[in-house]
């Protein structure tokens, strides 16, 4: 069965910064990736990134620089300020379409625990839906 | 199928102001970014800027931050770019276009004269 | 911003001719992360709005004839037309997908003959 795993970093150096990082374990092909916040993409979530992997990328603020780590990866840095910035209980969520596997999609956001600077490891978050 | 209908054309005079819009059919109107490019004779296509109707929230070229503003209505289904300060270089034909650039409107012809 | 130059600015061919237009970036499109090329090609025939004809640098949208062929990576791209029709009349232009903003080609201006 796919799964999706999402991490979610706070820089050390600027408190209102985010790195989210994504990635999808199937061995299907991934034909496009998005990125929310606040939920899921469609049930109340914001987009902040869209990537396809032969289309480019696509990000709306507070999303800085979104990219492809690998062919079935991707990170997406956030920084914001006033109401655009993300806070500690954020979530974010990614949903990876993939052919055959449908869309899954998986959501995460900063471990209580966590220092700035220090992040759970990348592991699968429970799938919410798969479509 | 996908449509995005755009008015033919727009006379305006110098110093003034112009909205144009953009409405889509055959898609949900929140999953599908907008994109607004100009084609003058000559020049070839500039990408303007882009704008999620879900989020609300656009991207700029730099260099028409000071000339447009994008904004969606989603209760109509439509993007606007307003164009302020017209003068006669920003005579040219408008386009808005869905997502990736795979669905075109037809183009509003803007002609600033006096 | 990247500057996509194309070449040449116009050419006539007759029917059934092969053509190639260049396109250049002055920055890589290739995407490190999963050794894709953002770019785009586009054709725009007179008194229509442009059409996306190839994504990717190579992959054909849906419906595009065959006889058209993107290539090329990193800076350097080319599209092909094997065997040119007379409804082939168009400008053509390439588009960065790499980077905001999304910066167009000047285009190449095909003429039949």
């Known amino acids: 069965t796919p799964e999706v795993w999402v991490q979610v970093r706070m820089e050390a150096t600027e408190l209102s910064s985010f790195t989210i990082r994504c990635g999808f374990l199937g061995s299907g092909s991934i034909s496009l990736v998005t990125v929310s916040w606040g939920g899921p993409n469609g049930a109340g979530g914001t987009t902040l990134a869209v990537l396809h992997p032969e289309r480019g990328i696509r990000q709306w603020a507070p999303a800085r620089q979104a990219r492809w780590e690998t062919q079935s990866s991707i990170s997406l840095i956030l920084e914001g300020s006033g109401a655009s910035s993300p806070c500690a209980n954020t979530t974010f969520c990614c949903k990876f379409a993939s052919f055959p596997e449908g869309s899954w999609e998986a959501c995460g956001s900063l471990p209580p625990s966590s220092d700035p600077g220090l992040s759970a490891p990348p592991t699968p978050a429970p799938i919410l839906r798969a479509d | 199928q996908v449509q995005l209908q755009q008015p033919g054309a727009e006379l305006v005079k110098p110093g003034t102001s112009v909205k144009l819009s953009c409405k889509a059919s055959?898609?949900?109107?929140?999953s599908y970014w907008i994109n607004w490019v100009k084609l003058r004779p000559g020049q070839g296509l500039e990408w303007i800027g882009d704008i999620y109707p879900g989020s609300y929230i656009p991207n700029y070229n730099e260099k028409f931050k000071n000339k447009a503003t994008l904004t969606v209505d989603t209760s109509s289904s439509t993007a606007y770019m307003q164009l302020t300060s017209l003068a006669s270089e920003d005579s040219a034909l408008y386009y808005c276009?869905?997502?990736?650039?795979?669905?075109w409107g037809a183009g509003t012809t803007v002609t600033v004269s006096s | 911003d990247i500057v996509m130059t194309q070449s040449p600015s116009s050419l006539s061919v007759s029917a059934g001719e092969k053509v190639t237009m260049s396109c250049k970036s002055s920055q890589s499109l290739l995407s490190s992360g999963n050794q894709k090329n953002y770019l785009a090609w586009y054709q725009q025939k007179p008194g229509q709005p442009p059409k996306l004809l190839i994504y990717?640098?190579?992959t054909r949208e849906s419906g595009v004839p065959d006889r058209f062929t993107g290539s090329g990576s990193g800076t350097d791209f080319t599209l092909t037309i094997s065997s040119v029709q007379a409804e082939d009349l168009a400008v053509y232009y390439c588009q960065n997908d790499h980077s905001y903003p999304y910066t167009f080609g000047g285009g190449t201006k095909l003429e039949i003959k």
């Open positions: 990717g640098a190579s």
């Open positions: 276009a869905g997502g990736y650039f795979d669905v």
């Open positions: 055959g898609y949900q109107f929140t």
